[in-house]
Interface confidence: medium
Protein backbone atom coordinates (compact mmCIF):
# COMPACT_ATOMS: atom_id res chain seq x y z
CA UNK A 1 0.00 0.00 0.00
CA UNK A 2 1.05 3.56 -0.57
CA UNK A 3 2.65 4.74 2.68
CA UNK A 4 4.09 8.16 1.85
CA UNK A 5 2.77 11.25 3.56
CA UNK A 6 1.16 12.03 0.23
CA UNK A 7 -1.07 9.00 0.34
CA UNK A 8 -1.81 9.27 4.04
CA UNK A 9 -2.96 12.84 3.50
CA UNK A 10 -5.09 11.78 0.57
CA UNK A 11 -6.74 8.94 2.48
CA UNK A 12 -7.51 11.19 5.44
CA UNK A 13 -8.94 13.88 3.17
CA UNK A 14 -10.80 11.38 1.02
CA UNK A 15 -9.27 12.72 -2.15
CA UNK A 16 -6.43 12.31 -4.59
CA UNK A 17 -4.78 14.91 -6.75
CA UNK A 18 -3.94 14.61 -10.40
CA UNK A 19 -0.36 13.91 -9.42
CA UNK A 20 -1.55 10.51 -8.27
CA UNK A 21 -4.20 10.05 -10.91
CA UNK A 22 -7.52 11.38 -9.60
CA UNK A 23 -8.57 15.03 -9.72
CA UNK A 24 -10.15 16.81 -6.79
CA UNK A 25 -13.60 18.30 -7.35
CA UNK A 26 -12.86 21.71 -5.95
CA UNK A 27 -9.83 23.88 -5.31
CA UNK A 28 -8.52 23.84 -1.76
CA UNK A 29 -5.34 25.87 -1.14
CA UNK A 30 -3.80 23.13 0.95
CA UNK A 31 -0.84 21.00 0.04
CA UNK A 32 -2.25 17.53 -0.53
CA UNK A 33 0.90 15.68 -1.39
CA UNK A 34 4.39 15.28 -2.68
CA UNK A 35 4.20 13.03 -5.70
CA UNK A 36 6.91 14.89 -7.56
CA UNK A 37 8.86 16.28 -4.64
Amino acid sequence: ACDTATCVTHRLAGLLSRSGGVVKNNFVPTNVGSKAF
Epitope: C2, T4, G21, V28, V32, K35
Partner: antibody, heavy 122, light 107 residues
Framework: EVQLVESGGGLVQPGGSLRLSCAAS????????ISWVRQAPGKGLEWVAE??????????HYAEAVKGRFTISRDNAKNSLYLQMNSLRAEDTAVYYC?????????????WGQGTLVTVSS | EIVLTQSPATLSLSPGERATLSCKAS??????VSWYQQKPGQAPRLLIY???NRYLGIPARFSGSGSGTDFTLTISSLEPEDFAVYYC?????????FGQGTKLEIK
Protein backbone atom coordinates in the same frame (compact mmCIF):
# COMPACT_ATOMS: atom_id res chain seq x y z
CA GLU B 1 10.38 35.63 -9.06
CA VAL B 2 10.58 32.25 -7.36
CA GLN B 3 13.97 31.42 -5.93
CA LEU B 4 15.53 28.74 -3.77
CA VAL B 5 19.12 29.49 -2.87
CA GLU B 6 21.23 26.93 -1.06
CA SER B 7 24.29 27.81 0.99
CA GLY B 8 26.57 26.31 3.61
CA GLY B 9 28.38 23.77 1.48
CA GLY B 10 32.12 23.33 1.58
CA LEU B 11 34.97 21.02 2.52
CA VAL B 12 34.67 19.09 5.76
CA GLN B 13 36.64 16.21 7.25
CA PRO B 14 35.08 12.79 7.80
CA GLY B 15 33.20 12.76 11.09
CA GLY B 16 32.63 16.49 10.90
CA SER B 17 29.44 18.53 10.73
CA LEU B 18 27.93 21.02 8.35
CA ARG B 19 24.67 22.95 8.24
CA LEU B 20 23.08 23.68 4.88
CA SER B 21 20.56 26.46 4.42
CA CYS B 22 18.01 27.12 1.73
CA ALA B 23 16.53 30.61 1.43
CA ALA B 24 13.18 30.80 -0.35
CA SER B 25 11.49 33.77 -1.98
CA UNK B 26 8.66 34.45 -4.40
CA UNK B 27 6.16 31.94 -3.00
CA UNK B 28 4.33 31.10 0.23
CA UNK B 29 7.09 29.02 1.79
CA UNK B 30 5.10 27.73 4.77
CA UNK B 31 2.63 25.93 2.46
CA UNK B 32 5.32 23.98 0.66
CA UNK B 33 6.71 20.53 1.30
CA ILE B 34 10.48 20.67 0.97
CA SER B 35 12.99 17.95 0.22
CA TRP B 36 16.74 17.78 0.05
CA VAL B 37 17.96 15.77 -2.94
CA ARG B 38 21.65 15.11 -3.52
CA GLN B 39 23.83 14.12 -6.45
CA ALA B 40 27.31 12.70 -6.04
CA PRO B 41 29.81 13.86 -8.69
CA GLY B 42 29.01 12.14 -11.98
CA LYS B 43 26.23 10.09 -10.40
CA GLY B 44 22.44 10.06 -10.26
CA LEU B 45 19.92 11.71 -7.97
CA GLU B 46 19.24 10.55 -4.42
CA TRP B 47 16.47 11.77 -2.13
CA VAL B 48 17.77 12.65 1.34
CA ALA B 49 14.98 14.07 3.50
CA GLU B 50 11.56 15.69 3.41
CA UNK B 51 9.75 18.12 5.68
CA UNK B 52 6.07 18.75 5.26
CA UNK B 53 4.28 22.08 5.46
CA UNK B 54 3.40 23.99 8.59
CA UNK B 55 -0.21 22.80 8.32
CA UNK B 56 1.09 19.24 8.23
CA UNK B 57 2.96 19.76 11.51
CA UNK B 58 6.29 19.93 9.65
CA UNK B 59 6.50 16.12 9.76
CA UNK B 60 9.84 14.72 8.57
CA HIS B 61 11.09 11.66 6.69
CA TYR B 62 14.65 10.54 5.97
CA ALA B 63 16.55 8.18 3.71
CA GLU B 64 18.06 5.24 5.63
CA ALA B 65 21.57 6.32 4.65
CA VAL B 66 21.25 9.56 6.64
CA LYS B 67 18.80 8.63 9.39
CA GLY B 68 20.21 9.53 12.80
CA ARG B 69 22.93 11.71 11.27
CA PHE B 70 20.99 14.38 9.35
CA THR B 71 18.19 16.61 10.62
CA ILE B 72 15.90 18.61 8.37
CA SER B 73 14.13 21.66 9.80
CA ARG B 74 12.43 24.84 8.67
CA ASP B 75 11.87 28.38 9.90
CA ASN B 76 8.76 29.66 8.16
CA ALA B 77 9.18 33.14 9.62
CA LYS B 78 12.53 33.38 7.82
CA ASN B 79 11.42 31.46 4.70
CA SER B 80 14.32 29.14 5.32
CA LEU B 81 15.07 25.43 5.28
CA TYR B 82 18.01 23.73 6.98
CA LEU B 83 19.86 20.45 6.86
CA GLN B 84 22.08 19.72 9.83
CA MET B 85 24.58 17.07 8.78
CA ASN B 86 26.59 15.27 11.46
CA SER B 87 29.06 12.36 11.37
CA LEU B 88 29.76 13.07 7.74
CA ARG B 89 31.22 10.35 5.53
CA ALA B 90 33.03 10.39 2.19
CA GLU B 91 29.89 9.00 0.57
CA ASP B 92 27.97 12.13 1.60
CA THR B 93 30.02 14.11 -0.92
CA ALA B 94 27.52 15.57 -3.36
CA VAL B 95 25.70 18.60 -4.64
CA TYR B 96 22.70 19.14 -2.35
CA TYR B 97 19.54 20.55 -3.89
CA CYS B 98 16.64 22.11 -2.06
CA UNK B 99 13.30 21.23 -3.71
CA UNK B 100 9.98 22.91 -2.97
CA UNK B 101 6.66 21.29 -3.78
CA UNK B 102 3.01 22.31 -3.58
CA UNK B 103 0.04 20.31 -4.87
CA UNK B 104 -3.11 22.29 -5.59
CA UNK B 105 -5.00 19.19 -6.68
CA UNK B 106 -5.58 20.54 -10.18
CA UNK B 107 -1.94 21.44 -10.69
CA UNK B 108 1.37 21.42 -8.86
CA UNK B 109 4.33 23.70 -8.29
CA UNK B 110 7.86 22.31 -8.18
CA UNK B 111 10.94 24.45 -7.61
CA TRP B 112 14.61 23.47 -7.44
CA GLY B 113 17.56 25.46 -6.18
CA GLN B 114 20.88 25.43 -8.03
CA GLY B 115 22.57 23.33 -5.36
CA THR B 116 25.48 23.61 -2.95
CA LEU B 117 28.51 21.30 -3.04
CA VAL B 118 29.49 19.35 0.05
CA THR B 119 32.88 17.64 -0.04
CA VAL B 120 33.82 15.22 2.74
CA SER B 121 37.52 14.47 2.60
CA SER B 122 40.58 14.40 4.81
CA GLU C 1 12.95 0.18 -1.15
CA ILE C 2 11.44 0.45 -4.60
CA VAL C 3 14.08 0.16 -7.32
CA LEU C 4 13.53 2.00 -10.59
CA THR C 5 15.39 0.63 -13.61
CA GLN C 6 15.72 2.89 -16.62
CA SER C 7 16.54 1.75 -20.13
CA PRO C 8 18.43 2.22 -22.24
CA ALA C 9 21.33 3.70 -20.29
CA THR C 10 22.26 5.74 -23.36
CA LEU C 11 20.11 6.60 -26.35
CA SER C 12 21.72 8.04 -29.48
CA LEU C 13 19.30 9.80 -31.80
CA SER C 14 19.16 12.70 -34.22
CA PRO C 15 17.07 15.88 -33.99
CA GLY C 16 13.60 15.26 -35.36
CA GLU C 17 13.55 11.62 -34.31
CA ARG C 18 11.26 10.11 -31.68
CA ALA C 19 12.73 9.12 -28.32
CA THR C 20 11.22 6.46 -26.07
CA LEU C 21 12.62 6.09 -22.55
CA SER C 22 11.56 3.31 -20.20
CA CYS C 23 11.32 3.13 -16.41
CA LYS C 24 10.42 -0.10 -14.62
CA ALA C 25 9.61 -0.26 -10.91
CA SER C 26 10.41 -3.26 -8.72
CA UNK C 27 6.98 -2.94 -7.08
CA UNK C 28 3.69 -1.42 -8.11
CA UNK C 29 3.67 2.37 -7.73
CA UNK C 30 0.27 3.11 -9.37
CA UNK C 31 0.88 6.46 -11.11
CA UNK C 32 3.20 8.08 -8.54
CA VAL C 33 5.98 8.55 -11.09
CA SER C 34 7.68 11.72 -12.28
CA TRP C 35 10.22 12.42 -15.01
CA TYR C 36 13.03 14.98 -14.74
CA GLN C 37 15.44 16.41 -17.28
CA GLN C 38 18.95 17.44 -16.26
CA LYS C 39 21.54 19.26 -18.30
CA PRO C 40 25.24 19.54 -17.30
CA GLY C 41 25.80 21.98 -14.48
CA GLN C 42 22.09 22.56 -13.96
CA ALA C 43 19.49 21.44 -11.45
CA PRO C 44 16.95 18.87 -12.63
CA ARG C 45 13.71 20.16 -14.15
CA LEU C 46 10.34 18.49 -13.68
CA LEU C 47 8.77 17.39 -16.97
CA ILE C 48 6.01 14.94 -16.09
CA TYR C 49 4.21 14.15 -12.83
CA UNK C 50 1.52 11.63 -12.00
CA UNK C 51 2.94 9.46 -14.81
CA UNK C 52 1.23 11.42 -17.58
CA ASN C 53 0.70 15.07 -16.57
CA ARG C 54 2.92 17.65 -18.25
CA TYR C 55 4.34 20.20 -15.83
CA LEU C 56 3.84 23.93 -16.35
CA GLY C 57 5.56 25.23 -19.47
CA ILE C 58 6.73 21.84 -20.71
CA PRO C 59 6.34 21.51 -24.50
CA ALA C 60 3.70 19.16 -25.89
CA ARG C 61 6.36 17.00 -27.54
CA PHE C 62 7.00 15.51 -24.08
CA SER C 63 4.50 12.91 -22.93
CA GLY C 64 4.39 10.29 -20.22
CA SER C 65 2.42 7.07 -19.94
CA GLY C 66 2.14 3.94 -17.85
CA SER C 67 0.86 2.69 -14.53
CA GLY C 68 1.70 -0.05 -12.08
CA THR C 69 5.31 -0.95 -12.78
CA ASP C 70 6.01 0.11 -16.39
CA PHE C 71 6.38 3.75 -17.42
CA THR C 72 7.45 5.54 -20.57
CA LEU C 73 8.61 9.03 -21.42
CA THR C 74 8.22 9.89 -25.09
CA ILE C 75 9.66 12.87 -26.92
CA SER C 76 7.81 12.97 -30.22
CA SER C 77 10.31 14.97 -32.26
CA LEU C 78 13.67 15.77 -30.72
CA GLU C 79 14.87 19.35 -30.54
CA PRO C 80 18.57 20.17 -30.05
CA GLU C 81 17.86 21.34 -26.48
CA ASP C 82 16.35 17.96 -25.54
CA PHE C 83 19.69 16.18 -25.39
CA ALA C 84 20.28 15.67 -21.68
CA VAL C 85 19.96 13.08 -18.91
CA TYR C 86 16.45 11.96 -17.94
CA TYR C 87 15.49 10.50 -14.57
CA CYS C 88 12.30 8.86 -13.42
CA UNK C 89 11.31 8.91 -9.76
CA UNK C 90 8.65 7.38 -7.57
CA UNK C 91 6.92 8.79 -4.51
CA UNK C 92 4.58 5.90 -3.78
CA UNK C 93 6.71 4.57 -0.92
CA UNK C 94 9.41 5.99 1.31
CA UNK C 95 12.18 6.35 0.53
CA UNK C 96 11.47 8.30 -2.63
CA UNK C 97 13.74 6.82 -5.27
CA PHE C 98 15.13 7.71 -8.68
CA GLY C 99 16.14 5.62 -11.64
CA GLN C 100 19.80 5.64 -12.62
CA GLY C 101 19.12 7.89 -15.60
CA THR C 102 19.05 7.68 -19.38
CA LYS C 103 21.51 9.83 -21.29
CA LEU C 104 20.00 11.10 -24.51
CA GLU C 105 22.83 12.04 -26.85
CA ILE C 106 23.08 13.36 -30.39
CA LYS C 107 23.85 10.67 -32.94
Amino acid sequence: EVQLVESGGGLVQPGGSLRLSCAASGFTFSNYWISWVRQAPGKGLEWVAEIRSESDASATHYAEAVKGRFTISRDNAKNSLYLQMNSLRAEDTAVYYCVGYFDYGLAIQNYWGQGTLVTVSS
Amino acid sequence: EIVLTQSPATLSLSPGERATLSCKASKRVTTYVSWYQQKPGQAPRLLIYGASNRYLGIPARFSGSGSGTDFTLTISSLEPEDFAVYYCSQSYNYPYTFGQGTKLEIK
